[in-house]
């Protein structure tokens, strides 16, 4: 969590002389409470925007905004504390609105807003905005809270974000799955536009059973500059059992940017439609299917890696 | 001293009901997401259900959704859990515990443990 | 949702030995993974989080690392104290799932 560059930020509007200052989280008139105390914020909202810093990196930030209750207690405002909290970590950061002068009511409604709490991708947060000074220790709450979750990297505005892209979002592998003959599944993928490794995971299941029954990895040499935005071939040979045949496949780029963390694709091929006259599955079958994998034997394709290759190479 | 401290643990039939209570100490409570796991008699750890600071966030693992509900006062430092239409696989050591700033979760209670059987 | 495996489910070694846990997460969690050590009959204790970062208080013989979808605890010499049940837990986002746990004993 972090605050959108170090400009100046600003809260002032006409008829009101405000400061934005960092914030422990922990307002003084928690320590030392106020008899007379605000109402709490009305309408609290939390949206989605962009905003670019100083380098010209796009980030997704919180757009956060609120109204005032029209009572006579914002005359006792002095300020208000933004806090967002990153539900995974707990992390937490704040800002205080510090007023320098007094509000005073005029025909419209006070309204409020800050655009300046950078969030990550996928990341769920709780945003508090609590009207300063905070309430005695058994007054009404002054604070309004909301949750916020922050769409991932595949949502379409998302994915032209500087943390995004890093991860490899623009990248479009098109992954394309065909079933041979022999036991054999094609994937083919487009290559990206950088000479990069790739691994291509496969993972089959029976279609009753959550359990996987058998996966390999397939690794991909980093393409030379002729082969980028080519399309790569990886052919698998699949599980003897025909019931070992629900299939998903992962493609994993090691893009720079991202290394082990970048964005990976998936596809999922399920199991063909059996007809009634089609043959039990034996018991003797299932034998192998549930033998403990020593840590060591996930990847049972090390002797197999000679059928992965670039398209242009057939 | 950081200290949790559950309660409300108890032998109860199928179909029943416990609420658990959570007690902190030592801690600003108000400022921490909180969290609630359980242990199966000689099984591993089941994340149950976490509830943010100001209760505006809030998530239940699939096992006990629509029959759990996890419930917090900052006024009286307390979380709690209750535990509704229970069946006997909730039978469980039902911790509490508050999550480390930067991950993963650092202080937690010792248990109280929950038996359904008929 | 995201599936956490850990391998081995058992491991039984000499005392100052190298003991490595793998956990693997069925997607990318990044780097928001945690271990934790549990003694028997007693309470969970966090030993590493954000993947590689030491608990304070912690012995420096515990380390983490890993990233992705692949992560790894490792022991630079086991010690008769470090008898124990270990988890990995994966905190991403919501359902913050654990691992099935490596149970770890001296030979």
């Known amino acids: 969590l972090r605050l959108l560059d170090h400009r100046a930020l600003v809260c002032s509007q006409p008829g009101l002389n405000c400061t934005v200052k960092n914030s422990t989280c922990l307002d003084d008139s928690w320590i030392h409470p106020r008899n007379l105390t605000p109402s709490s914020p009305k309408d609290l909202q939390i949206q989605l925007h962009f905003a670019h810093t100083q380098q010209g990196d796009l980030f997704p930030v919180a757009h956060i905004e609120w109204t005032l209750q029209t009572d006579a207690s914002i005359l006792y405002l002095e300020g208000a504390e933004l806090s967002v909290l990153q539900l995974n970590t707990n992390e937490r950061l704040c800002v205080k609105f510090q007023f320098l002068s007094m509000l005073q009511h005029h025909r419209k409604r006070w309204r409020f807003s800050f655009s300046h709490f950078v969030v990550d991708p996928g990341q769920e947060y709780e945003v508090t905005v609590h009207h300063l000074p905070k309430p005695i220790p058994d007054g009404d709450p002054n604070h309004q809270s909301k949750n916020f979750l922050v769409p991932d990297c595949e949502h379409a505005r998302m994915k032209v974000t500087t943390p995004c892209m890093s991860s490899g979002s623009l990248w479009d592998p098109n992954i394309t799955v065909e079933t041979l003959e022999a036991h054999q599944l094609r994937v083919s993928f487009t290559l990206w536009n950088e000479s990069t490794p790739y691994q291509v995971l496969l993972e089959s299941f029976s279609d009753s059973e959550n359990h996987s029954c058998f996966d390999v990895v397939k690794q991909i040499f980093a393409p030379r500059q002729e082969e980028f935005h080519q399309r790569a071939n990886v052919t698998f040979t699949l599980s003897k059992f025909h019931w070992c045949c629900h299939h998903h496949v992962q493609v994993q780029p090691f893009f720079s940017s991202c290394l082990n963390d970048c964005l990976r694709h998936a596809v999922t091929v399920p199991c063909p439609v059996i007809s009634n006259t089609t043959v039990p599955k034996p018991v003797a079958d299932y034998i192998p299917l549930w033998e403990p994998r020593s840590g060591s034997s996930d990847y049972k394709d090390d002797d197999d890696k000679g059928s992965s290759h670039h398209h242009h190479h057939h | 001293e950081v200290q949790l401290v559950e309660s409300g643990g108890g032998s109860v039939q199928p179909g029943g009901s416990l609420r658990l209570s959570c007690a902190a100490s030592?801690?600003?409570?108000?400022?921490?997401?909180m969290n609630w796991v359980r242990q199966a008699p000689g099984k591993g750890l089941e994340w149950v259900s976490i509830?943010?600071?100001?209760?505006?966030?809030?998530h239940y693992a699939d096992s006990v959704k629509g029959r759990f509900t996890i419930s917090r006062d900052n006024a009286k430092n307390s979380l709690y859990l209750q535990m509704n239409s229970l069946r006997d696989e909730d039978t469980a050591v039902y911790y509490c515990a508050r999550p480390k700033v930067g991950g993963g979760m650092d202080v937690w209670g010792q248990g109280t443990t929950v038996t359904v059987s008929s | 949702d995201i599936q956490m495996t850990q391998s081995p489910s058992s491991l039984s070694a000499s005392v100052g030995d190298r003991v490595t846990i793998t956990c693997r997460a069925s997607q990318g969690i990044s780097n928001y993974l945690a271990w934790y050590q549990q003694k028997p009959g007693k309470f969970p204790e966090l030993l590493i989080y954000a993947a590689s970062t030491l608990q304070s208080g912690v012995p420096s013989r515990f380390s983490g690392s890993g990233s992705g979808t692949d992560f790894t605890l490792t022991i630079s010499s086991l010690q008769p104290e470090d008898v124990a049940t270990y988890y990995c837990?994966?905190?991403?986002?919501?359902?913050?799932?654990f691992g099935p746990g490596t149970k770890v004993d001296i030979k």
């Open positions: 837990q994966k905190y991403n986002r919501a359902p913050f799932t």
């Open positions: 030592g801690f600003t409570f108000s400022s921490y997401s």
């Open positions: 509830i943010s600071s100001r209760s505006s966030i809030i």
